[in-house]
C-alpha cells in the first residue's frame, strides 16, 4: 500500500479520529517509507556483508545519489524552509530512477520494494502541495534516467548488490534528514 493504514480518505474504521494535518500526513508517510526501507535492508544485509562495511570503504562509487548539504538549507545551521523544501522534492524526484532499479532486486520483499516506490510518489505529491516555489524544482530528464537504468542493470552481480545497498542506505539517510528538517517547519 502506498499510504500508511488509516491514511486513506475512504478509511471509515475510526470516524472519531481527528483528520491529520498536512504536516502530520507527510511525517507519517516518511516514517512508513523508512519502515519499508528497513525491511529491504534486512534482506540485503542477510545476503551480503556490505552493511558492516564502513562508509569510507563504500565511498568509491560512481552513483550520483542525492545527498543533503549545508547549502540546501535543511540543517539546523542555515535552515531555510523554502530552499529546503525544494531540495527535498528535487532529491525525491532524483531518487525515483534508483527506486525503479530496486524493483526485481528482491526475492522475499518484492511487494515491499514496490510499496516503497509507490509511497515515495505519494510523498512527492504531498510535498508539492506544501511547496510555494514549484518553479524552482527541476524534474530529471526521462531519457537520461532510462540510460542510467540500463547501465545499472548491466552491471555484474557484485556491483548490483553494492548498488542496491548504497541506494537503500542513501535513501534512508536522505529521508531521515528530510524528516528532521520538516519537523522544524
Amino acid at each position: 500500500a502506498p499510504v500508511p493504514p488509516g491514511e486513506d480518505s475512504k478509511d471509515v474504521a475510526a470516524p472519531h479520529r481527528q483528520p491529520l494535518t498536512s504536516s502530520e500526513r507527510i511525517d507519517k508517510q516518511i516514517r512508513y517509507i523508512l519502515d519499508g526501507i528497513s525491511a529491504l535492508r534486512k534482506e540485503t544485509c542477510n545476503k551480503s556483508n556490505m552493511c558492516e562495511s564502513s562508509k569510507e570503504a563504500l565511498a568509491e562509487n560512481n552513483l550520483n545519489l542525492p545527498k543533503m548539504a549545508e547549502k540546501d538549507g535543511c540543517f539546523q545551521s542555515g535552515f531555510n524552509e523554502e530552499t529546503c523544501l525544494v531540495k527535498i522534492i528535487t532529491g525525491l524526484l532524483e531518487f525515483e530512477v534508483y527506486l525503479e532499479y530496486l524493483q526485481n532486486r528482491f526475492e522475499s520483499s518484492e511487494e515491499q520494494a514496490r510499496a516503497v516506490q509507490m509511497s515515495t510518489k505519494v510523498l512527492i505529491q504531498f510535498l508539492q502541495k506544501k511547496a510555494k516555489n514549484l518553479d524552482a524544482i527541476t524534474t530529471p530528464d526521462p531519457t537520461t534516467n532510462a540510460s542510467l537504468l540500463t547501465k545499472l542493470q548491466a552491471q555484474n552481480q557484485w556491483l548490483q548488490d553494492m548498488t542496491t545497498h548504497l541506494i537503500l542506505r542513501s535513501f534512508k539517510e536522505f529521508l531521515q534528514s528530510s524528516l528532521r528538517a520538516l519537523r522544524q517547519m
Epitope: L34, S38, E70, F75, E173, L175, Q176, R183
Partner: antibody, heavy 116, light 110 residues
Framework: SLEESGGRLVTPGTPLTLTCTAS????????VTWVRQAPGKGLEWIGI?????ETAYATWAIGRFTISKTSTTVDLKMTSLTAADTATYFC??????????????WGQGTLVTVSS | AIQMTQSPSSLSASVGDRVTITCQAS??????LSWYQQKPGKAPKLLIY???TLASGVPSRFSGSGSGTDFTLTISSLQPDDFATYYC????????????FGGGTKVEIK
Amino acid sequence: SLEESGGRLVTPGTPLTLTCTASGFSLSNYYVTWVRQAPGKGLEWIGIIYGSDETAYATWAIGRFTISKTSTTVDLKMTSLTAADTATYFCARDDSSDWDAKFNLWGQGTLVTVSS
Amino acid sequence: AIQMTQSPSSLSASVGDRVTITCQASQSINNELSWYQQKPGKAPKLLIYRASTLASGVPSRFSGSGSGTDFTLTISSLQPDDFATYYCQQGYSLRNIDNAFGGGTKVEIK
C-alpha cells in the same frame, strides 16, 4: 565500546576539546551525541552529529560548542568555558537505523572542571 | 521548543513494590520516547525506546507505555538492583530545544 578523553581542570575562558573514540566498530555508520551531567544534577543534552556534516545543538550550546567526526573519533570543541560548564561529559551512540533519537551505547564519561 | 517534564523528582519504595514514573512532553512526540537508568558514578543505560520497546537485556519487570504527550515507566516488582535515577528522553526533534531529557526521578529505598 566508547571512551571519552580530554577532560581536565581548566581556567575560565580556556578552550577545550574532548574526544570520543570507538572500539570494535566504525563511527561513520552511527550518529553520535554528547551529553553532560553537572555534579549532583540531571542529564543535559549538548548536541549530535548525524552524517559527516549535519549537526544539531541545544539552544544554549549553539556557537560555543562544535561537534566534528572522523571514522574513528568524534570531537566536542568547547569555548568560553565558565564554572557552570563543570560536569562529566558523556558521548553516546545512536544506531541511526530509525528516525527517532535514542542512545544505546554510552562511554563512561570524562570530567571537566572549570575553576580559577 | 519541546520540553520534557518528569514526575516525581524522587520517590521512596520497598523491594517488591510497583513503581510508576511519568513523563510529559510539551507537544506531541508520537511514541518517540526513551527511558534510561543511571546509577551513581556510572553512565546511563537505555531501558526502553519507542515508548514501550524493551532494550536488549533489560528485565521484563520494566515496561513503558504512552503516546503523544504522556508517558509512563513502570517497574512491576522493584528489585534491589533497581534503586537508581531514571530519565526520559524525547527523540522526536533535537532542534531548537534546551534539553532532550526530563529532569530525572530518583528511586530510593524506603
